[in-house]
């Protein structure tokens, strides 16, 4: 669920290659699937399968596509406007303490507990105590990486295409 975007994720572009389409920014922003040129005059398309941008933006670089790890399946490929969608393989899930890898789901509940939730790509099987109904399950965490920026960005009117 969390966005993990750091400086390494930014994919530097070479000077616009012939296959990279250019267009003009609209009120300082480029549409999804593009980034802005250093001089701010052009919108340069992201490279299909290599990098992407999801929103209208003034990014100098598109964002690098995620590669699915072993133990993950690719639900949809990276496009110029969408990152790769990866998911843990069947029988595994992403654990709170180690979101970077898929872990095997438990095969059953401890004695005195009953299963009320199945193994999913984002949670282990869910068990509850027969008497109390207290839950035991895993959850997907929210991980954030800070990118430094200057405080107090001035107000700006909304920008969009004509």
């Amino acid at each position: 669920e969390s966005a993990l975007i750091t400086q390494q994720d930014l994919a530097p572009q070479q000077r616009a290659a012939p296959q990279q389409k250019r267009s003009s920014p609209s009120e300082g922003l480029c549409p999804p699937g593009h980034h802005i040129s250093e001089d701010g005059r052009d919108c340069i398309s992201c490279k299909y399968g290599q990098d992407y941008s999801t929103h209208w933006n003034d990014l100098l670089f598109c964002l690098r596509c995620t590669r699915c790890d072993s133990g993950e399946v690719e639900l949809s490929p990276c496009t110029t406007t969408r990152n790769t969608v990866c998911q843990c393989e069947e029988g595994t899930f992403r654990e709170e303490d180690s979101p970077e890898m898929c872990r095997k789901c438990r095969t059953g509940c401890p004695r005195g507990m009953v299963k009320v939730g199945d193994c999913t790509p984002w949670s282990d099987i869910e068990c509850v105590h027969k008497e109390s109904g207290t839950k035991h399950s895993g959850e997907v965490p929210a991980v954030e990486e800070t990118v430094t920026s200057s405080p107090g960005t001035p107000a700006s009117p909304c920008s969009l295409s004509g």
Partner: antibody, heavy 122, light 107 residues
């Protein structure tokens, strides 16, 4: 866990400017990959997306409101704000701030603030 | 703008019932659709993202499916806490747009 809270006047006079602030706690507004949105809900009606701001200050808004909307961010206070000018009774709504995950694999609004009812009336 | 149309606008059901809500987009949005649940006086709460079936912390009785223009949210066995209004939202293009909502009421 990131939490959002809206603040501002609950009553605004017609033709004036509605001003709201969203305070973010439990995480930095400067975290890359998140877009910070405003969404409103007219009484008994559905949801309308107003616009978003990135920590860099770039904004994008719903064309239906574009000319009246200004969104700003103050990373030192971990806040972002909405200004809606020339309000009328039609702008009476519950205003929500929400985080939009821009990672590209997942794209939904979560979490949301609790909402603030703004009534436009003289 | 992409118009999102939900049906029915309201549905009366009993605890244990299977409930299906439909959301239709005015143009194709691939699988980029989210579902939210809203209870009176509260903010909407994210439920499911169809492109990945992601629903962390959401009971498994909720499921979302569909692609292109037609989508469904299914509650396999309605529980007392599920009585609420449900909204779909397209995340394919800007501006982001929501369906008008489907209210699930107690029969």
């Amino acid at each position: 866990q990131v939490q959002l809270q809206e603040s501002g006047p609950g009553l605004v006079k017609p033709s004036q400017t509605l001003s709201l602030t969203c305070s973010v706690s439990g995480g930095s507004i400067s975290s890359g990959g998140y877009y910070w949105s405003w969404i409103r809900q007219h009484p008994g009606k559905g949801l309308e997306w107003i616009g978003y701001i990135y920590y860099s200050g770039s904004t994008y808004c719903n064309p239906s409101l574009k000319s009246r909307v200004t969104i700003s961010v103050d990373t030192s206070k971990n806040q972002f704000s909405l200004k809606l000018s020339s309000v009328t009774a039609a702008d009476t709504a519950v205003y929500y701030c929400a985080r939009d995950n821009g990672s590209g694999s997942y794209d939904w609004f979560d979490p949301w603030g609790q909402g603030i009812l703004v009534t436009v009336s003289s | 703008d992409i118009q999102m149309t939900q049906s029915p606008s309201s549905v009366s059901a009993s605890v244990g019932d299977r409930v299906t809500i439909t959301c239709r987009a005015s143009q194709g949005i691939s699988s980029w659709l989210a579902w939210y649940q809203q209870k009176p006086g509260k903010a909407p709460k994210f439920l499911i993202f169809v492109a990945s079936s992601f629903q962390s912390g959401v009971p498994s009785r909720f499921s979302g499916s569909g692609s292109g223009t037609d989508f469904t949210l299914t509650i396999s066995s309605l529980q007392p806490e599920d009585f609420a209004t449900y909204y779909c939202q397209q995340a394919n293009s800007f501006p982001r747009t929501f369906g008008q909502g489907t209210k699930v009421e107690i029969k």
